[in-house]
Interface confidence: medium
């Protein structure tokens, strides 16, 4: 025969729990009902009566089947240095994320707390571990051979330039310049100024030998009958 | 966690009184329910008088108009005045308390006992 099926609220067999979404109430001795996500207990069950729901009120909710006599509050508002992800709902709480250039100082269940700035790495120093959610940028100095010229969250020491004739050392805030070898001349009519082809490379400046990343002028080169020498171009 | 420290218990003549008293410490944010359960020798926890916050009480039958429940929910605890007592009210009276908000959520919490025996 099959089992009976008992309605709520039922005395549970002795050593037996209640069924899902159903609760123990210590006092009652009953299994009772629990209230679906979005509502709470208004009155709560009697031997004879089942749990009451209610819907939460505006600005409360409830995540999971339950039966607290109250809904729970949302939190507060997302602050200026936060997005808010999850709105407020019966059914979920406001959740607020920290936006971009913000890492969560102080997390709480769901979301964050407290949002702080990504730390930015002054020149001569870049980033040794990225930012993340949860944590702060790690600037580390830049090693010999390697530079940052900038002040940022993001940006890595770079390896020096590599020069035939260094007219300026790199230290860690400043790559190396480059110099001409080429012999000097006097400009021969019709000389023409070419630009030093030069590649952006993270704000920081390193001769190429591809003219079509070559933005800005480094160098003015005289343009003779013969070719350039050999290191004219920066290398 | 929640500690619960009973008390009152003690040795009474059948026709007498006892008032015994259980505090909860802990870990208490709002409480579903309160109150006592007895043992026997060779038998399980039975419930004998429990309060609900929001008012609603339940007794065993044996005890119906003999005792009586109540709770200071200022100072977390629960009463229970036992009246006319009989032979047959001895036992471990165990106190309880019934979580209704997180960590301990639905959670059960028991003190230690505190025996009660009436000579007949």
């Known amino acids: 025969l099959p089992a009976q099926v008992a309605f709520t609220p039922y005395a549970p067999e002795p050593g037996s729990t209640c069924r899902l979404r159903e609760y123990y109430d210590q006092t009652a001795q009953m299994c009772c009902s629990k209230c679906s996500p979005g509502q709470h207990a208004k009155v709560f069950c009697t031997k004879t009566s089942d749990t009451v729901c209610d819907s939460c009120e505006d600005s409360t909710y409830t995540q999971l089947w339950n039966w607290v006599p109250e809904c729970l509050s949302c939190g507060s508002r997302c602050s200026s240095d936060q997005v808010e992800t999850q709105a407020c709902t019966r059914e979920q709480n406001r959740i607020c994320t920290c936006r971009p250039g913000w890492y969560c100082a102080l997390s709480k269940q769901e979301g964050c707390r407290l949002c702080a700035p990504l730390r930015k790495c002054r020149p001569g120093f870049g980033v040794a571990r990225p930012g993340t959610e949860t944590s702060d940028v790690v600037c580390k100095p830049c090693a010999p051979g390697t530079f940052s010229n900038t002040t940022s969250s993001t940006d890595i020491c770079r390896p020096h330039q590599i020069c035939n004739v260094v007219a300026i050392p790199g230290n860690a805030s400043m790559d190396a310049v480059c110099t001409s070898t080429s012999p000097t001349r006097s400009m021969a009519p019709g000389a023409v100024h070419l630009p030093q082809p030069v590649s952006t490379r993270s704000q920081h400046t390193q001769p190429t030998p591809e003219p079509s990343t070559a933005p800005s002028t480094s160098f003015l080169l005289p343009m003779g009958p013969s070719p350039p020498a050999e290191g004219s171009t920066g290398d | 966690e929640v500690q619960l420290v009973e008390s009152g218990g003690g040795l009474v003549q059948a026709g007498g009184s006892l008032r015994l008293s259980c505090a909860a410490s802990g870990s208490i944010v709002s409480t579903n329910g309160m109150g006592w359960h007895r043992q026997v020798p060779g038998k399980g926890r039975e419930l004998v008088a429990g309060?609900?916050?929001?008012?609603?009480?339940n007794y065993a039958d044996s005890v119906k108009g003999r005792f009586t429940i109540s709770s200071d929910n200022v100072k977390n605890t629960v009463y229970l005045q036992m009246n006319s007592l009989k032979a047959e009210d001895s036992g471990v009276y165990f106190c309880y308390y019934q979580a209704l908000s997180s960590p301990n959520y639905g959670q059960t919490f028991w003190g230690q006992g505190t025996q009660v025996t009436v000579s007949s």
């Open positions: 309060i609900r916050s929001d008012g609603f009480t």
